[in-house]
């Protein structure tokens, strides 16, 4: 009896795993084996596909074959018993185009109200993604184990922290990778669950801000309790995309180790030009808080985000404030090539009640003032980039007296 060729050959490629599946064309014939050949583009000869010779099942793995993943290849299969079937040719394909991204590896660290997610490619040193390893982005689905209501988070990098969770609660999540440059979406990881810890009696420090004074950076934060010590760590922001890099390590700022105040001062030359992440942790000697939320810190913006310079024209019921570029040492104006908004605070000299105006314009009217009254004004600049969210320190206060009545023209 003539053997029939196998049919419906499927090629599955996940990361560096090459799997072939096919259908037997005649279930009634026993003890049949199957063999594959392959052919590279531009070659006439067929080569035996190692790992896929004399296979008794309907599946084989040819991952050991060292292929150029960007080069088209052709496969053919036949059945064998005493005689052989004719060859069945599979449509040619390019491995890279056909490949799917496998499930990533996920490691979770629990805090009381946050989870830190570390993600790495499922296949270490993958040949398939060798040129794209740093281009992976990830997305995840997270849910409370008790409710099952899913939240999706897109476009995250290899390390991501989810905040505002509940203590002592089990959360589950799954992660998949994407290579947006190649329009590839990967396979989800297995579900990972972790329980957040009991609430830490020491909350993390909050409202971390960096400002510049003289040749130093001043880092300030808020804390609930007194008599604490704090440590500050930094990381190059670009490393968040690549924790596999051996440089991915949070480092101490030497002048901010075990400080007993809610601020620390360190020289500007500690950091070269660049974008950094900063975080702060509190300790009372026995217990330690979890790390604060990380803030982004851009030396370029920080160094030049100086308090605005302004002039006041006084009227009887208002001030006109004209904001100019801040001056550097040597009295040269600083050119700021990013959009700013200005926060202007003013108050009656005899009172502590402050009022605030926020404006994008550089000429601002402060209305509803009383005649012949001394008002004080200070201002600061903010970047309009939400991610960087930087502010200058406030300018020195300038105090002026309003004019007598009926001089509002």
């Amino acid at each position: 009896k003539n053997l029939k060729s196998p049919q419906k050959v499927e090629v599955d490629i996940i990361d560096d795993n090459f799997i072939l599946r096919w259908n037997r064309s005649d279930e009634s014939v026993g003890n049949v084996t199957f063999s594959f050949d392959y052919q590279k583009t531009g070659m006439d000869n067929w080569i035996k596909l190692s790992g896929c010779q004399n296979i008794t099942s309907t599946k084989c793995n040819f991952s050991s074959l060292k292929l150029n993943v960007y080069e088209e290849i052709k496969l053919r299969i036949r059945a064998e018993k005493e005689n052989t079937s004719s060859w069945y040719e599979v449509d040619s394909f390019t491995p890279f185009r056909k490949a799917q991204i496998g499930p990533p590896e996920v490691h979770l660290e629990a805090e009381d109200k946050a989870i830190v997610i570390h993600i790495s490619p499922g296949t270490k040193d993958s040949v398939m993604w060798a040129l794209d390893g740093l281009s992976f982005t990830y997305s995840l689905v997270i849910w409370k184990n008790s409710s099952g209501v899913e939240e999706r988070i897109e476009n995250i990098y290899s390390r991501h922290k989810i905040y505002k969770l509940s203590p002592e609660t089990t959360y589950c999540l799954k992660v998949k990778a994407a290579l947006l440059t190649s329009w590839k979406i990967g396979v989800y990881s297995p579900v990972h669950c972790i329980k957040t810890t009991v609430e830490n009696e020491l909350p993390p420090p909050e409202n971390i801000e960096v400002s510049v004074q003289n040749q130093n950076y001043v880092l300030k934060w808020d804390y609930t309790y007194a008599n604490m010590t704090f440590q500050v760590q930094w990381l190059h922001a670009f490393l968040k995309r690549n924790p596999g890099n051996h440089l991915y390590k949070w480092k101490q700022i030497p002048d901010c180790e075990n400080v007993k105040t809610t601020q620390c001062v360190f020289p500007q030359n500690v950091f070269q030009k660049g974008i950094y992440l900063l975080r702060v942790q509190a300790s009372d000697g026995n217990n330690t808080s979890f790390w604060s939320e990380e803030i982004k810190f851009d030396t370029e913006i920080q160094a030049f985000l100086l308090p605005p310079v302004f002039n006041i024209r006084s009227l009887s019921d208002s001030f006109h404030i004209y904001i100019g570029a801040p001056k550097q040492s040597g009295n040269t104006p600083v050119i700021q090539d990013y959009p700013l908004i200005y926060e202007i605070i003013f108050w009656e000299n005899t009172s502590n009640a402050e009022r605030k105006i926020i404006e994008k314009k550089t000429d601002v009217t402060v209305p509803n003032l009383k005649p012949l009254t001394v008002y004080c004004v200070k201002a600061r600049a903010h970047t309009m980039d939400e991610k960087l969210n930087k502010s200058s320190v406030f300018s020195d206060a300038v105090c002026e007296k309003t004019k007598p009545g009926n001089t509002s023209k």
Partner: antibody, heavy 123, light 107 residues
Framework: QVQLVQSGAEVKKPGASVKVSCKAS????????MNWVRQAPGQGLEWMGK????????HFNQKFRDRVTMTRDTSTSTVYMELSSLRSEDTAVYYC????????????????WGQGTLVTVSS | DIQMTQSPSSLSASVGDRVTITCKSS??????LAWYQQKPGNAPKLLIS???TLESGVPSRFSGSGSGKDYTLTISSLQPEDFATYYC?????????FGQGTKLEIK
């Protein structure tokens, strides 16, 4: 697979120093902390300290701070622990053990251990 | 330093028994707790990390629970190869500290 192979047993006199080595294989050496733990005969486990093989940053148990040195050689994926001014109570099996990834936010458990090196201090 | 107190210090049990070992820390350790098994002449072997996560290759009869300062290792049905000494360890604050150990013996 991950393997940590330690140097052989040592016999030392009180006041001397001992240097134990731990050769790592099967993983990226510079990506994980390496810890040292000791166990006196019939006793429990005692953490001595840890080293980051990528930059040699160390953290020590205060008890050993003045006597212990931890170093590494990235070319051979080996870490070393040297204990000086030995006394009889330092007789113990000394283990190296891999800790968490250096990129983790917090410390992790010790997932792989060397076979141990018996150090005997005797006059 | 954080003190870890394990109980009992020794325990006799039979194959098939359910066994529970407890570990208390002097401070809250936020689930940064590991359980190790050690057999005579061998290095410790990690069984459970993060208080509850079973390491790959560890039989499912081992389980960990607890939070705050109180943690438990349970072996649901003792097997002959489970007779050994078990240690808990906190890795929340340096220096990392271990419990004094629980020796599990055949009854």
């Amino acid at each position: 697979q991950v393997q940590l192979v330690q140097s052989g047993a040592e016999v030392k006199k009180p006041g001397a120093s001992v240097k134990v080595s731990c050769k790592a294989s099967g993983y990226t050496f510079t990506s994980y902390w390496m810890n040292w733990v000791r166990q006196a005969p019939g006793q429990g486990l005692e953490w001595m300290g840890k080293i980051d093989p990528s930059d040699s940053e160390t953290h020590f148990n205060q008890k050993f701070r003045d006597r212990v040195t931890m170093t590494r050689d990235t070319s051979t994926s080996t870490v070393y622990m040297e204990l000086s001014s030995l006394r009889s109570e330092d007789t113990a099996v000394y283990y190296c053990a891999r800790g968490g990834r250096i990129s983790f936010d917090y410390d992790a458990a010790l997932d792989y251990w060397g076979q141990g090196t018996l150090v005997t201090v005797s006059s | 330093d954080i003190q870890m107190t394990q109980s009992p210090s020794s325990l006799s049990a039979s194959v098939g028994d359910r066994v529970t070992i407890t570990c208390k820390s002097s401070e809250v350790i936020y689930n940064r707790l590991a359980w190790y098994q050690q057999k005579p002449g061998n290095a410790p072997k990690l069984l459970i990390s993060g208080a509850t996560t079973l390491e790959s290759g560890v039989p499912s009869r081992f389980s960990g629970s607890g939070s705050g300062k109180d943690y438990t290792l349970t072996i649901s049905s003792l097997q002959p190869e489970d007779f050994a000494t078990y240690y808990c360890q906190q890795y929340w604050n340096k220096p990392f500290t271990f419990g004094q150990g629980t020796k599990l013996e055949i009854k």
